[in-house]
Interface confidence: medium
Amino acid sequence: AQEVQQSPHCTTVPVGASVNITCSTSGGLRGIYLRQLGPQPQDIIYYEDGVVPTTDRRFRGRIDFSGSQDNLTITMHRLQLSDTGTYTCQAITEVNVYGSGTLVLVTEEQSQGWHRCSDAPPRASALPAPPTGSALPDPQTASALPDPPAASALP
């Protein structure tokens, strides 16, 4: 069965730093999402080989990719306190498959000692239920994204 290996399980970084999240699969997928979990889960990126990735508005200009969709490293730069959360990879295959999640703790530099990752991976209960709709990939454009400006600022 298809699996998604995700690392690290947890990382603590100061504000302004960067973090790498790696999602590895055995291949045979259409594309891969990175999602931020929580009360209101959000799609952060969608990556598919050969097309331009889509990236959430909050991370526009702060995301780099290396590797391929089968072994993808996502680098999030200039982290903010509000970026703290659990991020999970989702491989789009015949059956959607989730990684174990990465807990990213973004801290003020002076308070890092109070916020440390344990060695335990994020609890499975933190993972989302599979989306209700299908999630088949398609060609991408480079913009996109949630947490947009108020409607009055829209064109």
């Epitope: 889960p41 959430d56 990939p137 454009t141 996109a144 949630p146 829209l154």
Partner: nanobody, 124 residues
Framework: QVQLQESGGGLVQPGGSLRLSCAAS????????VGWFRQAPGKEREGVAC????????YYADSVKGRFTISRDNAKNTMYLQMNSLKPEDTAVYYC?????????????????WGQGTQVTVSS
């Protein structure tokens, strides 16, 4: 090529409800993030509600939060906008749109495919 066709608009009294539908042809909608936009006379087009291809992420304009609900039925290749507690200021032409990209975006220029629009009038 994607073709979109809205339906369900009409005249409704303040406080009433309408359900707009947008049927897609030419491709499957589940490959696209989709949204509803509206344009009132003399005003710019504004984003009302958007939903990602995965259905995980949604966006609602502040003016419609708690009153409007966007949804999609990929089996029927259709998306919907349920509008409750309608107000006169909701009067506008409502457009559905689809974008080549899987994540929600409320910027109208990021949507490549548009319906022709359906008129919604809220008046007593």
């Amino acid at each position: 090529q994607v073709q979109l066709q809205e339906s369900g608009g009409g005249l409704v009294q303040p406080g009433g409800s309408l359900r707009l539908s947008c049927a897609a042809s030419g491709t499957t909608l589940d490959d696209y993030a989709v949204g509803w936009f509206r344009q009132a006379p003399g005003k710019e087009r504004e984003g009302v509600a958007c939903i990602s291809a995965s259905e995980l992420s949604t966006y609602y304009a502040d003016s419609v939060k708690g009153r409007f609900t966007i949804s999609r039925d990929n089996a029927k290749n259709t998306m919907y906008l349920q509008m409750n507690s309608l107000k006169p200021e909701d009067t506008a032409v409502y457009y559905c749109a689809a974008r080549v990209g899987r994540i929600v975006d409320v910027t109208s220029t990021q949507y490549q495919y548009w319906g022709q629009g359906t008129q919604v009038t809220v008046s007593s």
